[in-house]
C-alpha cells in the first residue's frame, strides 16, 4: 500500500503519500483554533507510472493506454486514498468547543 | 459542475473532463472486444485552484494552504468524480457475451 | 476464476539469463493484459512487461534484456530476461488482468550474484 508506513520509510518518486505540516497560525492564517497548533496534513505527489495502484477500472484503461502510448498526456494522477480526522479545540466565546473535522489528515494514496 | 456539458463546451485551462478516445485495437492491443471498436474514456487534467470543486476537507486546506502559500509544492489534483459504466461485446470461443464494464467513461472531475 | 503459477526463479551470476513461466488456470477471457511484475526487498512491486493481444510494453530499465511473449493457446507466459544485473534481483509476480480484476500468482525468487 502508498501509505505512511511505506512511503516515509523509503525514497520514492513514484506516487506516495509525503509528509506536510500545516502551522495553523503561520501557513492558514487561521486564530481560531485552540488546539492542536498545527498537524501533519500530508499530501500525495508523484508519477503514476506502469498501472500504479490504479484505483477504478477507468484508470486502469488509462494507465495501460499511458503505458503502451508513452507520448500520450492523459495520464492517472496521485491522490488521496484514506483519510482520517482531526480533533480541534476552539472558542465561541467563552465557551470551548470540540469538533472532529473529518477527513483532514492523508494516511494513503492511490492513482486515480 | 466540471463535467462534459461544461468542459466539452468551453476553453477551460483549469481543472476539467477532457475527451480521449481509445481505439481497443490501435491503442491497446485488444483484438478481444467485438463492439464497440472504441469508445470516449475521457480524462481529467488542469491546476486545481484554491476551492475549485475541492472534493474533502483536506483538499480545502490543502487548496488554502497551496494559494496562501505560493511556493509550496502540495496542491489538489484533478481526478474522476463520476464515471459511468461500458457495455461490450466479445466471444468466448462461439458464445457471445455482453458485459458492463463499471467506471469505464469520466463524466466529471473533481480536485482531490 | 483465474489461478497463475510461476516457475523458473533462482540464482543467476551477473550476465546470465533465466526464463520465466507462468501458467493460467480457469476461465481465461477478456484479458486487459498479462504481465510480470517484481518486488525488491522494502520496495512497491512495479512492472516489468506487460503484454495485451498484439502490444507489449517494457520498463525502461529492462528494455532490451527482457522479452515477454504469450501462448494464448496454452495459456501461458513467460519472461525471457538475458544480461541479468544484481539490480534485477527481486521477487517476480505473474499478473493477468480479467476485464478490470488483477490476479496474481504467488511469485518466484530470481537472485543474481555472484
Known amino acids: 500500500a502508498l501509505d505512511t508506513n511505506y512511503c516515509f520509510r523509503n525514497l520514492e518518486e513514484n506516487c506516495c503519500v509525503r509528509p506536510l505540516y500545516i502551522d495553523f497560525r503561520q501557513d492558514l492564517g487561521w486564530k481560531w483554533v485552540h488546539e492542536p497548533k498545527g498537524y501533519y496534513a500530508n499530501f500525495c505527489s508523484g508519477p503514476c507510472p506502469y498501472l500504479r495502484s490504479a484505483d477504478t477500472t477507468h484508470s486502469t484503461v488509462l494507465g495501460l493506454y499511458n503505458t503502451l502510448n508513452p507520448e500520450a498526456s492523459a495520464s492517472p494522477c496521485c491522490v488521496p486514498q484514506d483519510l482520517e480526522p482531526l480533533t480541534i479545540l476552539y472558542y465561541v466565546g467563552r465557551t470551548p468547543k470540540v469538533e472532529q473535522l473529518s477527513n483532514m489528515v492523508v494516511k494513503s494514496c492511490k492513482c486515480s | 459542475a466540471l463535467d462534459t456539458n461544461y468542459c466539452f463546451r468551453n476553453l477551460e485551462e483549469n481543472c476539467c473532463v477532457r475527451p480521449l478516445y481509445i481505439d481497443f485495437r490501435q491503442d491497446l492491443g485488444w483484438k478481444w472486444v467485438h463492439e464497440p471498436k472504441g469508445y470516449y474514456a475521457n480524462f481529467c487534467s488542469g491546476p486545481c485552484p484554491y476551492l475549485r470543486s475541492a472534493d474533502t476537507t483536506h483538499s480545502t486546506v490543502l487548496g488554502l494552504y497551496n494559494t496562501l502559500n505560493p511556493e509550496a509544492s502540495a496542491s489538489p489534483c484533478c481526478v474522476p468524480q463520476d464515471l459511468e459504466p461500458l457495455t461490450i461485446l466479445y466471444y468466448v470461443g462461439r458464445t457471445p457475451k455482453v458485459e458492463q464494464l463499471s467506471n469505464m467513461v469520466v463524466k466529471s472531475c473533481k480536485c482531490s | 476464476q483465474v489461478q497463475l503459477v510461476e516457475s523458473g526463479g533462482g540464482l543467476v551470476q551477473p550476465g546470465g539469463s533465466l526464463r520465466l513461466s507462468c501458467a493460467a488456470s480457469g476461465s481465461i477471457f477478456g484479458v486487459f493484459y498479462m504481465g510480470w511484475f517484481r518486488q525488491a526487498p522494502g520496495k512497491q512491486r512495479e512492472m516489468v512487461a506487460i503484454?495485451?493481444?498484439?502490444?507489449?510494453s517494457y520498463v525502461d530499465s529492462v528494455k532490451g534484456r527482457f522479452t515477454i511473449s504469450r501462448d494464448n493457446a496454452k495459456n501461458t507466459l513467460a519472461l525471457q530476461m538475458n544480461s541479468l544485473k544484481p539490480e534485477d534481483t527481486a521477487v517476480y509476480f505473474c499478473?493477468?488482468?480479467?476485464?478490470?480484476?488483477?490476479?496474481w500468482g504467488p511469485g518466484t525468487q530470481v537472485t543474481v550474484s555472484s
Open positions: 503484454s495485451t493481444d498484439d502490444r507489449t
Open positions: 499478473n493477468l488482468n480479467q476485464l478490470g480484476t488483477d490476479y
